[in-house]
Every structure is written in structure tokens, then in C-alpha cells.
């Protein structure tokens, strides 16, 4: 009686259960009554990540340097390549098919979270008592200078974009 279902890591063909090819190998010929399944290793820059009956291996993803991409983890015969972005850039999607330059935080805003290869810079407005006078992808908001600790007084108030200006205390006549 020919089988209607096969064991794990097998497939049904011509009323017969044949072994699947292991990850990293592709199918060359199905098994017969007298021969085992014939499999061949994937070639250079190719992979198959499951037990399979594929006759062609998949090409590794190409991390195109012209799109700002580089290889984060090289593919093997069983795994695909993982791409990431060059420093200063981040992926435009989860698949990381291209990169864009990290955003800078404008004056009045500081970096809340520095960008990574997969996420952009997160900026936050400088709260009262803090300032940022540069456009930067790294700088946080800096606290205003404390004039009092220097035995000085505030001559000009600070803003979210400028530090306070300290000056000498008025001498009592």
C-alpha cells in the first residue's frame, strides 16, 4: 500500500517517501525504489535555511555599498546575509534595503537617543534650565551655567538655545 503521508524531513513523490535535503543543500534528484534522494551543497553566496526539496538555492542578499549598506553578518550556506548601514546612517526599513543619514537635532533640541544602524536619532526639546546651541546627532541638552557657584550673577538669562551670561555682582556703595 503506497503511503499517503510521510515522516518529518521527508516528502511524498511518486507514491514514495523521500528524504528532504538538509539546510545548505539543494535537490538534484528524487529518491527511487532503489536510490536515496540526491542533494548538493549550495554554491558560493547561496543558501537554503530549511529542510527542503528546492532545486535552486537562494542568492544571499547583497549589501550594496552604493546604498550605504555593509555586511553586518555574512551569510552561510544555511543563512542569509544580514545588512546594516555604514556609521552615520540607518536603515530605511526593517529589511534594511537602503540607508539614510542620521537626523541631527536642531539648536534648542538635544539628543534623547543616539541613532543606531536601524533607528534614527530621537530629539527632545531642551527644558527650562538646559540649552543646545548646535545642530548635532550626538549632543544632549546642556545645563545652564550656575553663576552662583562662581560667585557671579546672571547678566543675561539663558534660553533653550543659549547659555546664561554671568557677570560680577554689583558692589554696594
Amino acid at each position: 500500500e503506497p503511503p499517503t503521508a510521510c515522516r518529518e524531513k521527508q516528502y511524498l513523490i511518486n507514491s514514495q517517501c523521500c528524504s528532504l535535503c538538509q539546510p545548505g543543500q539543494k535537490l538534484v534528484s528524487d529518491c527511487t525504489e532503489f536510490t536515496e534522494t540526491e542533494c548538493l551543497p549550495c554554491g558560493e553566496s547561496e543558501f537554503l535555511d530549511t529542510w527542503n526539496r528546492e532545486t535552486h538555492c537562494h542568492q544571499h542578499k547583497y549589501c550594496d555599498p552604493n546604498l550605504g549598506l555593509r555586511v553586518q553578518q555574512k551569510g552561510t550556506s544555511e543563512t542569509d546575509t544580514i545588512c546594516t548601514c555604514e556609521e552615520g546612517w540607518h536603515c530605511t526599513s526593517e529589511a534594511c534595503e537602503s540607508c539614510v543619514l542620521h537626523r541631527s537635532c536642531s539648536p534648542g533640541f538635544g539628543v534623547k537617543q543616539i541613532a543606531t544602524g536601524v533607528s534614527d536619532t530621537i530629539c527632545e526639546p531642551c527644558p527650562v534650565g538646559f540649552f543646545s546651541n548646535v545642530s548635532s546627532a550626538f549632543e544632549k541638552c546642556h545645563p545652564w551655567t550656575s553663576c552662583e557657584t562662581k560667585d557671579l550673577v546672571v547678566q543675561q538669562a539663558g534660553t533653550n538655545k543659549t547659555d546664561v551670561v554671568c557677570g560680577p555682582q554689583d558692589r554696594l556703595r
Partner: antibody, heavy 113, light 109 residues
Framework: QSVEESGGRLVTPGTPLTLTCTVS????????MSWVRQAPGKGLEYIGV?????SAHYATWAKGRFTISKTSTTVDLKITSPTTADTATYFC??????????WGPGTLVTVSS | AVLTQTPSPVSAAVGGTVSISCQSS????????LSWFQQKPGQPPKQLIY???TLASGVPSRFKGSGSGTEFTLTISDVQCADAATYYC??????????FGGGTEVVVK
């Protein structure tokens, strides 16, 4: 950004030795790290690589003779049972062979009885 | 994988051009995962070229890498005395079967 090897010294044959590659200015979750060695007066020899995901791959000749592992800022190369043939300067390099690299100055291992 | 380089040493005259070949026993990763390194005695290797033809930062444009798949060439034009060194090709492959060539010594006359 820099990489620096340490731990090289004189050891007797069969005494395990661990070399450390310390990185600064970049993350090991973003870059693979390769190990290469060079015997005195000889050519460069690829040992293996630590992938960003934490898996290590070895040159065929190096399997069983070396173990590569990592922490958040270091990548270690353990010479499991050194022989005199393992006397060499050991280098770690950021990235895969063939791609852009950043190399350390190397650390010298001498195996002698 | 095995990388076979031009037999060593290779002689070059100051101001002249020298080419070093590197043949791989199989295609390198992406067909371009090949680097060229320069090494002088007592120094670590210095990367000149990566991804077969991209010039590393700070390397003079006199150094040029070419080739794809299994055949690669490093060409040094307008050779200088400072170019006297040993040059290595290095290939990256799937499953990290990476390798270095045996090295080619360049002697400048």
C-alpha cells in the same frame, strides 16, 4: 575607534592560553571580529571570526585548536593546547576578511618548553 | 579556499609599474570580497584595497585593485622606495572559509 590585542606571553606546550581583543569606539553587535596570526618570518594565516550574532566560525585547520568567544567589549581567542607551531603574532581585526578592516598591533605568543 | 599569488619576489624600478596577481580556488563572497594588504617588517598589515577595488582611507591612488570572482590584480604605478614591502591578498567566502595568499615581496630598485 581602535582594537588592541593582549595576553600574549611565553607558555609551555599544552598549557591553554587566552588572548583578548579589546575594542573601543564601536559595538561588537555591529561588527564581526576576525583573528589572524603570523609565525615569525612567515605569511598571514586566517584563524576564524566571531559574528555579530555570537556564533564563531573557524578555518578548517583551526577547528578544535582554537575557541573564539566574546563579551560586550572584548573578543577572546583561546589556544586550547598550544604546540611550538603556534608560536606567532596574533592579530584581531574588525570586520570580515575582504571588507574594510581595522587591525590591532598584535600580541606575541611564544610556545616553548 | 586557496589563494595563489604571483611568485615572490617581484622587482620594480622607482617610477615604474608593478602588478601582482591573486587567483582564488573558488569565487569569493559577492564576487568582490577580496582585500590587498601591505606589510613591512615589524608592523601589522595595512589594508590598501577592500571589496576588490575600493581604496582604503589614506592610501595613495597609485594603488589600484581590479578583478572579480576568482582573478584579482593589485597594480602599483609610479613605484616609490616606500612601496618596498610584502603584499598579501585575502579573500572572504561563504561559511567563513576565508584565506590569505602566500604573500609577494616587492623589491624596489
Amino acid at each position: 575607534q581602535s582594537v588592541e590585542e593582549s595576553g600574549g606571553r611565553l607558555v609551555t606546550p599544552g598549557t591553554p592560553l587566552t588572548l583578548t581583543c579589546t575594542v573601543s569606539g564601536f559595538s561588537l553587535s555591529s561588527y564581526a571580529m576576525s583573528w589572524v596570526r603570523q609565525a615569525p618570518g612567515k605569511g598571514l594565516e586566517y584563524i576564524g571570526v566571531m559574528n555579530t550574532g555570537g556564533s564563531a566560525h573557524y578555518a578548517t585547520w583551526a577547528k578544535g585548536r582554537f575557541t573564539i568567544s566574546k563579551t560586550s567589549t572584548t573578543v577572546d581567542l583561546k589556544i586550547t593546547s598550544p604546540t611550538t607551531a603556534d608560536t606567532a603574532t596574533y592579530f584581531c581585526a574588525r570586520g570580515y576578511i575582504g571588507s574594510p578592516n581595522l587591525w590591532g598591533p598584535g600580541t606575541l605568543v611564544t610556545v616553548s618548553s | 579556499a586557496v589563494l595563489t599569488q604571483t611568485p615572490s619576489p617581484v622587482s620594480a624600478a622607482v617610477g615604474g609599474t608593478v602588478s601582482i596577481s591573486c587567483q582564488s580556488s573558488k569565487s569569493v563572497y559577492y564576487n568582490n570580497y577580496l582585500s590587498w594588504f601591505q606589510q613591512k617588517p615589524g608592523q601589522p598589515p595595512k589594508q590598501l584595497i577592500y571589496l576588490a577595488s575600493t581604496l582604503a582611507s589614506g592610501v595613495p591612488s597609485r594603488f589600484k585593485g581590479s578583478g572579480s570572482g576568482t582573478e584579482f590584480t593589485l597594480t602599483i604605478s609610479d613605484v616609490q622606495c616606500a612601496d618596498a614591502a610584502t603584499y598579501y591578498c585575502a579573500g572572504g567566502y561563504t561559511d567563513s572559509d576565508d584565506a590569505f595568499g602566500g604573500g609577494t615581496e616587492v623589491v624596489v630598485k
